[in-house]
């Protein structure tokens, strides 16, 4: 039975040209996290495999940095980066858990950044 839950940064906003950390945390399960996939709509941004390390999709390689931890740093933001992002946790033996983050990239310099999410 899948007992885990994914905590995410939820809805966040950031300034055009700035950067943002996308982060999720899986709790309430003893399942082993084998891999985390980061996706935007139907596009893969990155994969963090516990053993193999990181894969960064070529179309994002200049704007995506691995980490911190299992998270992802998105840099040089544009308004086109606005949208839904998904963290897909592959775990054993539970299976797959998915978290959702909505990012809004604002033109204004008064964009309110969501509080940095810390993994306990």
């Amino acid at each position: 039975m899948m007992t885990g839950t994914i905590e995410t940064t939820g809805n966040i906003s950031a300034e055009k040209g700035g950067s943002i950390i996308l982060q999720c945390h899986l709790s309430s399960t003893t399942a082993q996290v084998t891999q985390v996939n980061w996706e935007q709509q139907d596009q893969l941004l990155a994969i963090c495999n516990a053993d193999l390390g990181w894969h960064i999709s070529p179309s994002f390689k200049d704007r995506v940095a691995p980490g911190p931890g299992l998270g992802l740093t998105l840099q040089s933001l544009t308004v086109n980066d606005t949208g839904e992002y998904f963290c897909i946790y592959h775990t054993y033996p539970d299976g797959t858990y998915t978290g959702r983050i909505f990012l809004e990239v604002l033109e204004s310099s008064v964009a309110e950044h969501g509080a940095r999410f810390q993994i306990p």
Partner: antibody, heavy 119, light 107 residues
Framework: EVQLVQSGAEVKKPGSSVKVSCKAS????????IHWVRQAPGQGLEWIGG????????IYNQIFRGRATLTVDKSTSTAYMELSSLRSEDTAVYFC????????????WGQGTTVTVSS | DIQMTQSPSSLSASVGDRVTITCKAS??????VVWYQQKPGKAPKLLIY???YRFTGVPSRFSGSGSGTDFTLTISSLQPEDFATYYC?????????FGGGTKVEIK
């Protein structure tokens, strides 16, 4: 020039073990994962697993777990794949491959090592 | 495990022909697909990754496309050196899995 040079062909009895080596050169060994893939005669490709020399992370295809052991010797930039409890179905060409940096694509391959399991 | 199904399993074509090979994943793999070329008695060679980027030295007649579950490798004008077997592979989740291969033969 990146090169992966594998050990020579082996003939083994059922129930025995084989250890194939793969010597890497032309790049920084610890910066790239080494994968192992096999190909039975006339068949397709099958992923065995990978070894990350950067932090000694090892991952196996479940169907080989318990029978395959992936190791490396960083001092000689050599990767090893040992397969135990051999059976006739393990007769195949075994390839070592290198994963590109920050990319899960196998960009350079060894020449292959033929392992024949026969009584 | 994710199954990768290639079609056709073999095809006959002439030099100059446009050739299309398809690969269908049994579940969503986003764009985590790679294509390899293998000639008899040789190791596979990386052609295309992610799934539309050509590896270093791969001629521009090779192109890849697709996302989700359906992927395509296209050779725009088949050359004599392109007669080989082509494999797709997914790395969206482990175990990494390959398609059964498509053998491109001379007509």
């Amino acid at each position: 020039e990146v090169q992966l040079v594998q050990s020579g062909a082996e003939v083994k009895k059922p129930g025995s073990s084989v250890k194939v080596s793969c010597k890497a050169s032309g790049y920084t060994f610890t910066e790239h994962v080494i994968h192992w893939v096999r190909q039975a005669p006339g068949q397709g490709l099958e992923w065995i697993g990978g070894f990350n020399p950067n932090h000694d992370g090892t991952i196996y295809n479940q169907i080989f777990r318990g029978r395959a052991t992936l190791t490396v010797d960083k001092s000689t930039s050599t990767a090893y794949m040992e397969l135990s409890s051999l059976r006739s179905e393990d007769t195949a060409v075994y390839f070592c491959t290198r994963a590109a940096k920050l990319l899960f694509a196998m960009d350079y391959w060894g020449q292959g090592t033929t392992v024949t399991v026969s009584s | 495990d994710i199954q990768m199904t290639q079609s056709p399993s073999s095809l006959s074509a002439s030099v100059g022909d446009r050739v299309t090979i398809t690969c269908k994943a049994s579940q969503h793999v986003s764009n985590a697909v790679v294509w390899y070329q293998q000639k008899p008695g040789k190791a596979p060679k990386l052609l295309i990754y992610s799934p539309s980027y050509r590896f270093t030295g791969v001629p521009s007649r090779f192109s890849g496309s697709g996302s989700g579950t359906d992927f395509t490798l296209t050779i725009s004008s088949l050359q004599p050196e392109d007669f080989a077997t082509y494999y797709c592979q997914q790395h969206y989740s482990t175990p990494w899995t390959f398609g059964g291969g498509t053998k491109v033969e001379i007509k």
